[in-house]
Amino acid sequence: QEGKFSGPLKPMTFSIYEGQEPSQIIFQFKANPPAVTFELTGETDNIFKIEREGLLYYTKALDRETRSTHNLQVAALDANGAIVEGPVPITIEVKDVNDNRPTFLQSKYEGSVRQNSRPGKPFLYVNATDLDDPATPNGQLSYQIVIQLPMINNVMYFQINNKTGGISLTREGSQELNPAKNPSYNLVISVKDMGGQSENSFSDTTSVDIIVTENIWKAPEPVEMVENSTDPHPIKITQVRWNDPGAQYSLVDKEKLPRFPFSIDQEGDIYVTQPLDREEKDAYVFYAVAKDEYGKPLSYPLEIHVKVQDINDNPPTCPSPVTVFEVQENERLGNSIGTLTAHDSDEENTANSLLNYRIVEQTPKLPMDGLFLIQTYAGMLQLAKQSLKKQDTPQYNLTIEVSDKDFKTLCFVQINVIDINDQIPIFEKSDYGNLTLAEDTNVGSTILTIQATDADEPFTGSSKILYHVIKGDSEGRLGVDTDPHTNTGYVIIKKPLDFETAAISNIVFKAENPEPLVFGVTYNASSFAKFTLFVTDVNEAPEFSQYVFQAKVSEDVAIGTKVGNVTAKDPEGLDISYSLRGDTRGWLKIDHVTGEIFSVAPLDREAGSPYRVQVVATEVGGSSLSSVSQFHLILTDVNDNPPRLAKDYMDLYFCHPLSAPGSLIFEATDDDQHLFRGPHFTFSIASESLQNDWQVSKINGTHARLSTRHTDFEEKEYVVSIRINDGGRPPLESTVSLTVTFCSCGEDGCFRPAGHQPGIPTVGM
């Protein structure tokens, strides 16, 4: 049948299950003149053959675990043996069957864990191998804890990552493990292939003995340090200790202070490096971190608290150079004139900041001295003697001594005698009518001018008018500023108006004096005015609940997986339609109604993470206003990139004849993320036929050395196939080729005929 089992020479891939006895031909290649025969080369392993007439077949059952892919080449030759077509690559993929059971690398594992270790952080890995294909269920292993001994209150203290075999503490284990109670535990772990999902899976078990050790990585007690210390600095104030020697300690100032007066040495001792000032900062919270030699944190940071103890190093200070109070002529004895409030920067509610007030001088002393008294601790001035007469003495000056337990300060008070407040403010209008404003009127705008008058003594607290909104504005959207010269009130917008919550407001103003009214006089209707505020609707765009929405998924999620969602609301209550903008890779779609975001194509961390798109929320109906937010999709890595050579290795050569076995170094890489430990590639010669001549040895996780096994090479080019495995989960493998030339060498390296001059040799013999 042309096409499936026969056809012209072209690159092809065939899949054959391992273990199957050969039962039929693989393919019949058809020759095009002048081709008359075919030739097969590559990784035949003496299993794959081609008849001269183009019949490709195999002679015995394949074993995927021996070779998972056979890279063959087929060429068409003419009647003189010259290649006239090809060679073309023919790939035989050996498909896996579950013919291998998983096996733990050890029958017994031992490990230790510190109490209070972070839950979920592996402290020990068990590792099983299964020779079957890790890209199929046959080689996908699933780990499970079968038994935990002892088991207290049926609570599991340990958990295992079913994919990686990493054993860690559960939340309960982190909180409750105590070496004083139970210093050791035993786990029985099972591993199953078929991802643990099949009755037909193979399994193995292993035993894990775990010792619980004490955790001394604990936050110390809070430290108290007296300010302005005159002792030599630095002064040790506390210490932290990692569980093992060799940790590198550092302090982290989360507050980003301009001056951070603490340090830590490599023993874990913490010092204050200079005198502290409680009035600058009364407490410090910072963190002690322990890291390994690679700078990687060994555990969570410890919070260090330092409280700065106060000393009395600050004198009282007056509120202003002169404090002015007013007193009406007819004030009664004992009435409060005002309160002098001095300040002391020392710690509040302690003896260091407790202030005493005392009047040390009154001028003039008319009609007598001692007209005023001050409450010793409160600072309230009261009238101590008869009522005052403005025509006799319109102004008094007091000198008041304010003291704490160590310092004294003099403050000055001016008392003005004013007429009695027997007139109330009277509005010029009781109703300021209606006012209509759009809800987007600017904050700070003056929307109305109001005016009241007061017949009391001008420019005193008896005639000064303060306006208050006492009704109709519970949200505090309006305010009134008073002109001190004219008592005109300017009504301003303090907070944005909102049609949706307050379309009509019936506003009531009250006009008052800062001075109390005389006995028998009260504010009446003349001191009140009203107006009605109508707010008109302005269609507003929808509002997102966040400016940036962020989600995290694995790069290998299935197409159609929900990867995140966004929400917006329309102030007018209209429905919202969501859309995406800037989805340059065509990875995502959004549900127009719910805002849920789904993948519609394979994601790829290596193409860029986070993947940033814009989300647009548009009103349905109305003015179709829209607003934009950001959606950032963080892609976590899976091992989906096979290893490759880190660069093109051109012009590798050895001088012929070899005097001794030679070697050269090459580097592998891949595009996956290698957090913490970096790549861990393994290397092997890909073809049995090459193994007598070449060997490859690993230098580190990325570099390997290709060496000759002998010196008996012809003067020609050799193509050496090398298999590189990245050891990932699942492990990916690829076969790369290094072309090595054995050639006559001159002073400038490898001699080749004109037209192919190599570069400077990259290989030293």
């Epitope: 003149p33 002048p34 008359v36 025969t37 003419d78 009647a79 043996g81 010259a82 080019e717 005929p753």
Partner: antibody, heavy 122, light 108 residues
């Protein structure tokens, strides 16, 4: 035993054509290609082309494309080389030769004809 | 086309001498595709060595060949009277098949 017997010497005028034959015996004619070479007096050998009688596949050297014609008569196990538009520089000894069986892995001219002398002269 | 350059073009030697003829190819070829032929005056060439180093049927063992890449040699370890002839190298790697210009071996 294998033999390749060529036709006799030819004298031709410039502009004319010549057809030289090569009759083979001692092997299966269709299993081998037949190649034609020539050797000008005192010069080296020059390859003209080949024919594979089994499939009537013919390949020419670029230099002789359009002027040389290779044919084969399977019934008489004879190969022919016709050269047209003759000029004096075509004066040479013309050889037919064959390599081993086309399934072989070693290809070289293991049997040769005795040569046919062509003289082109006005 | 691949060029074949033989050296020397001619060579005088005596019976019993060791003689080496070289053939340089203008581009690298597989050693299995380089052959040597011997031609005597008035006769067709006859195969001497194929695949660089394999003696053709009936060729005495005093003839040998070696080389790889672009440089190949024909060696006669001890010249015999019947060895005086013209020798050609030929490549079977690319069409058109090409021959060296020949090396004429004469009696000194």
């Amino acid at each position: 035993q294998v033999q390749l017997v060529q036709s006799g010497a030819e004298v031709k005028k410039p502009g004319s054509s010549v057809k030289i034959s090569c009759k083979v015996s001692g092997y299966t004619f269709t299993d081998h290609t037949i190649h034609w070479m020539r050797q000008a007096p005192g010069q080296g050998l020059e390859w003209i082309g080949y024919i594979f009688p089994r499939d009537d596949i013919v390949v020419y050297a670029q230099k002789f494309q359009g002027r040389a014609t290779l044919t084969a008569d399977k019934s008489t196990s004879t190969a022919y080389m016709e050269l047209s538009s003759l000029r004096s520089e075509d004066t040479a000894v013309y050889y037919c030769a064959r390599p081993p069986y086309y399934y072989s892995r070693n290809f070289y001219f293991d049997y040769w004809g005795q040569g046919t002398t062509l003289t082109v002269s006005s | 086309d691949i060029q074949m350059t033989q050296s020397p073009s001619s060579l005088s030697a005596s019976v019993g001498d060791r003689v080496t003829i070289t053939c340089r190819v203008s581009s690298i070829i597989s050693s299995s595709k380089l052959h040597w032929y011997q031609q005597k005056p008035g006769k067709a060439p006859k195969p001497l060595i194929y695949g660089t180093s394999t003696l053709a049927s009936g060729v005495p063992s005093r003839f040998s060949g070696s080389g790889s890449g672009t440089d190949y040699t024909l060696t006669i370890s001890s010249l015999q009277p019947e060895d005086f002839a013209t020798y050609y190298c030929q490549q079977w790697s690319n069409y058109p098949f090409t021959f060296g210009q020949g090396t004429k071996l004469e009696i000194k």
